[in-house]
């Protein structure tokens, strides 16, 4: 089918466009181009007869058109009026007509835009600024750039007037930036020169430097003032309210005690009309003062608060030193010194951080020490401990229980028996107890400063007779040659004898067996697999003798060096190879095989049917015990001979 392609489709004024013809039929008589979407003699641009190769201009010919033998039409020096449709009329040799229409659009080349502003010196937090992109151009798109980035999303930025106007509401000093606008149409894009927004601001509260406020007599005082401001601020200095000079720096050489006082810096912005002042109190000492420590928190709470200790006074050109517990500062991530060493910060204080702390000021001759400061760290209460630890008492004795919980300030204590409040004391005393005094004894510790409470509950049984004992262990699965195990015979009772048996026999003499805690605890050091036996404890008092159920120690061990069976290493071709690996281990190990270093299967038995000399090589069995984290292996060389070549060889399994 006959089609027209416009190259380009969007054409800039003054440029050219080619109306390219596709699928032009053969055996043509001629063709004609028309302006518009139909064949209209009044709007013919040019005609062409193939036989004569003659081009004939039509009424719409402008002299800028060139027709090519392939029927394509070139239009040069494009003007706005050229926009629109163009129709090609083709007359074939059989005088049958064919038509096709194409089109293009003409756009002007855009000029370089510029930015106009409604306020050249807006005041921070007060004024708005509207930037407008000039000129206003039809069919153009407007874009804005801030510091060569696209516009940030902000409620203070608003685009209007078809994006031609950018308004900044309530300008801030951070709006001081390079602003550009860009105009775009299908044939061109132009960017303006940048406009720098000059936001007037300040002055902010001035800062006086250096920060130190303590000086020695004879030193020079050199104070500098700075306040953020646009335009830059004008500065004035006042000493004790009296004007001194209109400079940014104040210099007084060889100061004396009389130069002590309040020093005021005033910053003034002539454009915004604003003034701000800052006052610093300068103290001039006749000679170095004795230092002292100030703290930002006199009662810090453990694990919650940080404490900043500052060595006063602040003196220029001075070395500050610190001591904790009469030692130089330990290295600790919780201890931080400021750059000038004047402030020591304890992050997340603990009860061990009480001190004492001392700071020192080093001068030419000596170090002046502050008085020591002790931190009052509030902590606790920790879980209270009830002593003694006995849970069984015989009738008729006095029950005297003491409760203690680490706490600052010291805890307040309460006792409850079976949930009923008894007394608000640290010690509970009951004389001549009977079985009716059996029950749950609760000690409650309360810290009035933190408001925290902690309780411990102890079951007390009053009985002449002891119960059947039981064994508790601190390690249910010890690892051979590594762990120790402590067995404890429960309960703990007064006037009680504790005894131990292993496999029904009294304890063997061994440096690895140790009795402690009144024979109530039996410790096995460096356990071995041979310690996996039945342990029984017995308790005896005035009226009872009783044994616990046995506890069997489950010692984890191995894997030992594995053994591969059968031991044969020579096989005849065609035999079956059936290797079994075994390693002493608890729990049972995991097995895996490698042949010539290549992993095989994860089984205890390796089976290969009808082996050949190709099966020669090294057969390695690997064992691993996940519980002990240990591994072991063994390697065996296997030789396979061709049948009948080597008498006396094993036939295999």
């Amino acid at each position: 089918k006959l089609t027209i392609e416009s190259t380009p489709f969007n054409v800039a004024e003054g440029k050219e466009v080619l109306l390219l013809v596709h699928n032009l039929p053969q055996h043509l008589f001629g063709y004609s181009w028309y302006k518009g979407e139909r064949v209209d003699g009044n709007r013919q641009i040019i005609g062409y007869v193939i036989g004569t190769q003659q081009a004939t201009p039509g009424p719409a010919y402008s002299g800028r058109e060139i027709i090519y033998p392939n029927a394509s039409l070139l239009i040069q020096n494009i003007i706005q009026n050229d926009t629109g449709f163009y129709t090609l009329h083709v007359i074939k040799s059989d005088l049958v007509n064919e038509e096709a229409t194409g089109q293009f659009r003409v756009y002007p080349e855009l000029p370089k835009p510029s930015i106009s502003s409604n306020n050249s010196k807006p005041v921070e937090d007060k004024d708005a600024v509207a930037f407008t992109c000039e000129p206003e151009t039809q069919d153009a798109t407007y874009l804005w750039w801030v510091n060569n980035q696209s516009l940030p999303v902000s409620p203070r930025l608003q685009l209007s007037n078809g994006n031609r106007t950018l308004t900044l509401f309530n300008v801030t000093r951070n709006d001081t930036a390079s602003y550009k606008c860009e105009t775009q149409n299908p044939v061109s894009a132009r960017r303006s020169d940048s406009v720098i927004l000059n936001v007037l601001y300040g002055p902010d509260a001035p800062t006086i430097s250096p920060l130190n406020t303590s000086y020695r007599s004879g030193e020079n005082l050199n104070l500098s003032c700075h306040a953020a401001s646009n335009p830059p601020a004008q500065y004035s200095w006042f000493v004790n309210g009296t004007f001194q000079q209109s400079t940014q720096e104040l210099f007084i050489p060889n100061i004396t005690v009389n130069n002590s006082g309040s020093y005021t810096c005033q910053a003034h912005n002539s454009d915004t009309g604003l003034n701000r002042t800052t006052v610093t109190t300068i103290t001039v000492y006749a000679e170095p003062p004795k230092p002292f420590i100030t703290s930002n928190n006199s009662n810090p709470v453990e694990d919650e608060d940080a404490v900043a200790l500052t060595c006063e006074p602040e003196i220029q050109n001075t070395t500050y030193l610190w001591w904790v517990n009469n030692q130089s500062l330990p290295v600790s991530p919780r201890l931080q010194l400021s750059n000038d060493n004047r402030t020591l910060t304890l992050l997340s204080v603990t009860r061990n951080d009480v001190g004492p702390y001392e700071c020192g000021i080093q001068n030419e001759l000596s170090v002046d020490h502050s008085d020591p400061v002790i931190l009052n760290v509030l902590y606790g209460p920790d879980d209270p401990t009830i002593s003694p630890s006995y849970t069984y008492y015989r009738p008729g004795v006095n029950l005297s229980l003491s409760c203690h919980a680490a706490s600052n300030p010291p805890a307040q204590y309460s006792w409850l028996i079976d949930g009923n409040i008894q007394q608000h004391t640290q010690e509970l005393f009951i004389s001549n107890i009977t079985e009716k005094n059996s029950g749950l004894y609760t000690c409650q510790a309360n810290n009035s400063a933190s408001g925290h409470s902690r309780t411990t509950v102890k079951t007390i049984t009053v009985s002449a007779e002891l119960p059947k004992p039981s064994i508790s262990s601190n390690n249910s699965k010890p690892v051979e040659d590594k762990d120790a195990v402590a067995f404890t015979c429960e309960p703990e009772a007064q006037n009680t004898t504790y005894l131990w048996w292993v496999n029904g026999q009294s304890l063997p003499v061994s440096p690895r067996l140790q009795l402690s805690n009144g024979n109530r605890t039996l410790t096995l050091f460096n356990v071995t697999r041979n310690d996996a036996r039945a342990y029984v404890c017995g308790i005896q008092n005035s009226v009872s003798a009783n044994r616990s159920d046995p506890v069997t120690l489950d010692v984890l061990y191995g894997p030992d060096t594995p053994i591969i069976s059968p031991p044969d290493s020579s096989y005849l071709s065609g035999a079956n190879l059936n290797l079994s690996c075994h390693s002493a281990s608890n729990p049972s190990p995991q097995y895996s095989w490698r042949i010539n270093g290549i992993p095989q299967q994860h089984t205890q038995v390796l089976f290969i049917a009808k082996i050949t000399p190709n099966n020669n090589g090294t057969y390695a069995c690997f064992v691993s015990n996940l519980a002990t984290g240990r591994n072991n292996s063994i390697v065996k060389s296997i030789t396979v001979s061709a049948s009948g070549t080597s008498p006396g060889l094993s036939a295999g399994a």
Partner: antibody, heavy 120, light 106 residues
């Protein structure tokens, strides 16, 4: 072999003091609590008390407190019972008794018993 | 004091019979212990801590119970079992005994 051998008079005058001794063999009394029990003729068993020979601690039944004293002599591996101001009601067979671990087993050992008659 | 009430006070049974003796304590006790005494002999510990047989005691003997009520059982009475049996509590002082159950053969 563990044994408790009792000795002491079989006849005591009213208002006098009954005194019995129990000598132990086969174990060390210092490691155990030693009891005394009595059985009046045709009546129930009555526990009198115990002594801890290691430190001399004692525990007496309230019925006998004030009249009874138990003592131990660990060097001789023996202990004794003294009951003062006896009456006919104190006529009984008196036993010494110990509960100990003999090897792996908890064992109960008794003396042969001494019949004490209170009579004038 | 904890009173121990043993019943029956005497019992006549045939060889092979199942025999049950009960002991009731006036207050709850941790365990009950049972003694066998033959005429002219010292008592022997027979069952300790409610249900454990003392060394050498035949398995036809058993004990059970908790709190205040305990039972002593002979599953099949034998001639050598003829004796007086006493219960004892050791939970609180003074230690107290029941007054015994005298066992006879019919």
């Amino acid at each position: 072999e563990v044994q408790l051998q009792q000795s002491g008079p079989g006849l005591v005058r009213p208002s006098q003091t009954l005194s019995l001794t129990c000598t132990a063999s086969g174990f060390n009394i210092k490691d155990n609590y030693m009891h005394w029990v009595r059985q009046p003729p045709g009546r129930c068993l009555e526990w009198i008390g115990w002594i801890d020979p290691e430190n001399g601690d004692t525990e007496y039944a309230p019925k006998f407190r004030g009249r009874v004293t138990m003592l131990a002599d660990t060097s001789k591996n023996q202990f004794s019972l003294r009951l003062s101001s006896v009456t006919a009601a104190d006529t009984a067979v008196y036993y010494c008794h110990v509960l100990i671990y003999a090897g792996y087993l908890a064992m109960d050992y008794w003396g042969q018993g001494t019949l004490v008659t209170v009579s004038s | 004091d904890i009173q121990m009430t043993q019943s029956p006070s005497s019992l006549s049974a045939s060889v092979g019979d199942r025999v049950t003796i009960t002991c009731s304590a006036s207050s709850s006790v941790t365990y009950m212990h049972w003694y066998q005494q033959k005429p002219g002999k010292a008592p022997k510990l027979w069952i300790y801590s409610t249900s454990n047989l003392a060394s050498g005691v035949p398995s036809r003997f058993s004990g059970s119970g908790s709190g205040t009520d305990y039972t002593f059982t002979i599953s099949s009475l034998q001639p050598e079992d003829i004796a007086t049996y006493y219960c004892q509590q050791r939970s609180t002082y003074p230690l107290t005994f029941g007054c015994g159950t005298k066992l006879e053969i019919k």
